[in-house]
């Protein structure tokens, strides 16, 4: 007799995804030799652990502290680009500024960037049928509460002036209800944080508007005086110009605003 | 079994372009890293760059910074490295190159290479 | 980057006889792991290189176990206790430490 098995609102587990997890993890290892002291194999061991026969309405923090601490990794602390809803963006800029580093760029995040997971309570299985939606089921599952605590360990980490690239073409341009809004914003440390620096990506050709002092962007500048850090945005234009511009400096053409 | 074919022999001008391609089977295309070495006639063999086929992403030698573009189409389990502004010091063999991965670690050894691909850069 | 010097860069044997090559790396190859960061290739005529050894001292699948490789952080050697005529063609360390990964000069081995 088939077992009952929980229907959940979101899609399930992505397919291959342990295998997909070892491999990203070996690959990582293999171009970031820093990182080669790093088993994968217990990687992948502490990464089931987290959700595996746990209920996936029922993950903790708690419950990723063994893969947290397998993933530990240092970036410079004053190259950190984090970003809301523009991640392919914000990619493309640390893949060409190779100094600077969005969480997809450590260990940790580039294991589990747009993968979905999730397991059944009491049962070793992974479940590839569906997991739980943050919104019409609930917000501790596996892969929302695995975001929250590397988001607020990456925002812990920061320090000197942090950059964050927003959505210039959404009507939220800064959402409260974002990762970055609601984790990273809330855990940059006041101590070693001096700047936090907005850059608003514009969507449209010809949109001059100076997207800084849209309503969600002053919303952003408030919280984060109120936390004692200083706040700076620059509107970015032309975002393939911008890239381009990252890729040659030198270029006559990269003088005038971008 | 594992395979990397790569494209014919090119002869090309000074100053043009070549895309020389490696086409993946009998593994995960996504799962490995891909390298591109190079070997000009009598010489010793040379470190171009890698592409996480992935996510497309890349890293390139300083040297050839400026002039090579690695790319992939993982529809295909292909990929291909572009090599611009030609000069008669590009007339090499280029080989796509993989690691062997043992028991979850990067060998860091390149187990399996293409077949090669002879560009010849004439005047 | 990392330069690897190879030696002797021509190497005559004859059948049977064992064979010794030399690597020696500019910086310490050893990580932090515990592996060290060295490979051995042998490639034949006309033939794209072949891995025979990585780590310094594993042979790579298939490798025949006349080929052993040692050393310590800088200093390497491939050994081949008996020298077969298959053997011939040019034999390359390499590092992969950190990137680039470089190659030696390469040693040429015919047979006498």
């Known amino acids: 007799v088939p077992r009952w098995r929980q229907q959940w609102s979101g899609p399930g587990t992505t397919k291959r995804f342990p295998e997909t997890v070892l491999a990203r993890c070996v690959k990582y290892t293999e171009i970031h030799p820093e990182m080669r002291h790093v088993d994968c194999q217990s990687v992948w061991d502490a990464f089931k652990g987290a959700f595996i026969s746990k209920h996936p309405c029922n993950i903790t923090e708690e419950d990723y502290q063994p893969l947290m601490k397998l993933g530990t990794q240092t970036v410079p602390c004053n190259k950190i680009l984090l970003w809301s809803r523009i991640k392919d963006l914000a990619h493309q800029f640390t893949q060409v500024q190779r100094d600077m580093f969005t969480l997809e760029d450590t260990l940790l995040g580039y294991l589990a960037d747009d993968l979905t997971w999730c397991g059944e309570f009491n049962t070793s299985k992974i479940n590839y049928q569906s997991c739980p939606d943050w919104r019409k089921d609930c917000s501790n599952n596996p892969v929302s509460v695995f975001w929250k605590t590397v988001s607020r360990r990456f925002a812990e980490a920061a320090c000197d002036v942090v950059h964050v690239m927003l959505n210039g073409s959404r009507s939220k341009i800064f959402d409260k209800n974002s990762t970055f809004g609601s984790v990273e914003v809330h855990n940059l440390q006041p101590e070693k944080v001096q700047t936090l620096e907005a850059w608003v990506i514009h969507g449209g050709r010809e949109d001059s508007r100076d997207l800084c002092q849209d309503p969600t962007i002053k919303e952003l500048e408030s919280i984060i005086s109120k936390r004692n850090i200083q706040f700076s945005c620059k509107n970015i234009y032309r975002p393939d110009k911008f890239l381009q511009c990252v890729k040659n400096p030198e270029d006559s053409s990269c003088t005038s605003e971008i | 079994q594992m395979q990397l074919v790569q494209s014919g022999a090119e002869v090309k001008k000074t100053g043009s372009s070549v895309k020389v391609s490696c086409k993946a089977s009998?593994?995960?295309?996504?799962?490995?890293?891909m390298h591109w070495v190079r070997q000009a006639p009598g010489q010793a063999l040379e470190w171009m760059g890698w592409?996480?086929?992935?996510?497309?992403?890349?890293d390139y030698a300083q040297k050839f910074q400026d002039r090579v573009t690695i790319t992939r189409d993982r529809s295909m389990s292909t990929a291909y490295m572009e090599l611009s502004s030609l000069r008669s010091e590009d007339t090499a063999m280029y080989y796509c190159?993989?690691?062997?991965?043992?028991?979850?670690?990067?060998?860091?050894?390149?187990?399996?290479w293409g077949q090669g691909t002879l560009v010849t850069v004439s005047s | 980057d990392i330069v690897m010097t190879q030696s002797p860069l021509s190497l005559p044997v004859t059948p049977g006889e064992p064979a010794s090559i030399s690597c020696q790396s500019s910086?310490?190859?050893?990580?932090?792991?515990?592996?060290?960061?060295l490979n051995w290739y042998l490639q034949k005529p006309g033939q794209s290189p072949q891995l025979l050894i990585y780590?310094?001292?594993t042979r790579a699948a298939g490798v025949p176990d006349r080929f052993s490789g040692s050393g310590s952080g800088t200093d390497f050697t491939l050994k081949i206790s008996r020298v077969e005529a298959e053997d011939v063609g040019v034999y390359y360390c390499q590092q992969f430490l950190e990137y680039p990964p470089t190659f030696g000069q390469g040693t040429k081995l015919e047979i006498k």
């Open positions: 592409i996480d086929p992935e996510y497309g992403s890349t």
């Open positions: 910086e310490s190859l050893l990580h932090s792991n515990g592996k060290t960061y």
């Open positions: 780590w310094m001292s």
């Open positions: 190159a993989r690691v062997a991965i043992i028991t979850t670690v990067a060998s860091g050894g390149f187990a399996y």
């Open positions: 009998g593994y995960t295309f996504t799962d490995y890293i």
